[in-house]
Amino acid sequence: EPHSLRYNLTVLSWDGSVQSGFLAEVHLDGQPFLRCDRQKCRAKPQGQWAEDVLGNKTWDRETRDLTGNGKDLRMTLAHIKDQKEGLHSLQEIRVCEIHEDNSTRSSQHFYYDGELFLSQNLETEEWTMPQSSRAQTLAMNVRNFLKEDAMKTKTHYHAMHADCLQELRRYLKSGVVLRRTVPPMVNVTRSEASEGNITVTCRASGFYPWNITLSWRQDGVSLSHDTQQWGDVLPDGNGTYQTWVATRICQGEEQRFTCYMEHSGNHSTHPVPS
């Protein structure tokens, strides 16, 4: 699977009047990465995994870029003629990818009221559009506007291609993305607690993405929540994550307890060492 960065921007109009603000979502390798809400764009990291690894500069830069792109998309929607009454949406999806062989892909796609009407390969500048006459009319309208705008602003689409790839490479370098899935290493340890009791700790480390289930089971049945202690899922500095779960058990009953781990569709059980 290639590494990918995907920007999804949506602007709205009501009775032919373009609404202020916009909605933006960014996905990194298919995972929600950051988001801007409608009225005030402030790029927000989606989840601890993004916030921990990337600093404020990232969010400032993405906020600035997304705000600019949102403004451009509102101008494009305002340019679409023959807008009927009611609510309408214009959506721009921009995707760039880096494949295993280091070849790259970049494209942008425009949707009006959820229907694709125009695409462009940002690397080669090739435009494509669906065969329907409505889509083609819309496509010519928007394409001509974008072409005029590009001539005025002297910005071309290969710049978008380069910018998207630059951001993706920056995120890859930062360690926020490693690979699609890295399975955890699971290690179970024991330590004396009080007379007749021991604490068993199950540690999972080196996994990606950060979503994981880790719990203790007795005779195959999960222990209640209040009898277990969980550590936070934390970055380990290598672009992967670590966490732990512990519980207290009676000495001599170790063989009845197992640590259950589930990650990215795979699961395993791990006994307490004797």
């Epitope: 290639p2 494949h99 295993e100 062989d101 070849s103 790259t104 892909r105 494209s107 390969n121 690397e123 080669t124 500048e125 090739e126 435009w127 494509t128 072409k147 590009a150 071309h156 689409y157 290969h158």
Partner: antibody, heavy 115, light 108 residues
Framework: QVQLQESGPGLVKPSETLSLTCTVS?????????WNWIRQPPGKGLEWIGF???????KYNPSLKSRVTISRDTSKNQFSLKLSSVTAADTAVYYC????????WGQGTTVTVSS | EIVLTQSPATLSLSPGERATLSCSAT???????FHWYQQKPGQAPRLLIY???NLASGIPARFSGSGSGTDYTLTISSLEPEDVAVYYC?????????FGQGTKLEIK
């Protein structure tokens, strides 16, 4: 009817610069599409050299990039190829072609590199 | 760069037979950026099929194309003597644009 026609010298000396021009009729090179140069050495396959797009952007094959320049003259509706420091390996039929799926081609011009 | 490998290198069939030409890419290609060309001896190539499965203008219906991802196929349902040519696949997904090495189609 869209037509493309290559022109330029058929013989170039080693180490010199190969210069070819493609004249386009029936379509404006600033309206749309990429305007490509493609070559074919004798008895071999096709190799894409590069293009100038409708917007003026140029893209080159990395294997030739250091030696290639593609430019356009919009007033004459022409685009040109310059390939510097040529060797015998650059002997080929040179084609100009329109698009990304190359829908119109010139008839090709044979360029021989020889002293 | 994306390398395209065509097979077989040469195909020799009788008139009326079905010809199947394959093109395999080293990396995934969007089907809208994949094309086939026919080149007859002494002529410039001509676009045969564009965007994987669309017949170019003036191309007879016995030619068809299919495929996605890394594997694409050109099929000639019933060979005619005038189909003798070299057939090239080409990708326009990413720079540099690349061609396959060609499949030479001969008539027995």
């Amino acid at each position: 009817q869209v037509q493309l026609q290559e022109s330029g010298p058929g013989l170039v000396k080693p180490s010199e610069t190969l210069s070819l021009t493609c004249t386009v009729s029936g379509y404006s090179i600033t309206s749309d599409y990429a305007w490509n140069w493609i070559r074919q050495p004798p008895g071999k396959g096709l190799e894409w050299i590069g293009f100038v797009s409708y917007s003026g952007t140029t893209k080159y094959n990395p294997s030739l990039k250091s030696r290639v320049t593609i430019s356009r003259d919009t007033s004459k509706n022409q685009f040109s190829l310059k390939l510097s420091s040529v060797t015998a390996a650059d002997t080929a039929v040179y084609y100009c072609a329109r698009g990304y799926g190359f829908d119109y081609w010139g008839q090709g011009t044979t360029v021989t590199v020889s002293s | 760069e994306i390398v395209l490998t065509q097979s077989p290198a040469t195909l020799s069939l009788s008139p009326g037979e079905r010809a199947t030409l394959s093109c395999s890419a080293t990396s995934s290609i969007s089907s809208i950026y994949f094309h086939w060309y026919q080149q007859k001896p002494g002529q410039a190539p001509r676009l045969l099929i564009y965007r994987t499965s669309n017949l170019a203008s003036g191309i007879p219906a016995r030619f068809s194309g299919s495929g996605s991802g890394t594997d694409y196929t050109l099929t000639i349902s019933s060979l005619e003597p005038e189909d003798v040519a070299v057939y090239y696949c080409q990708q326009g997904t990413t720079i540099p644009f690349t061609f396959g090495q060609g499949t030479k189609l001969e008539i027995k």
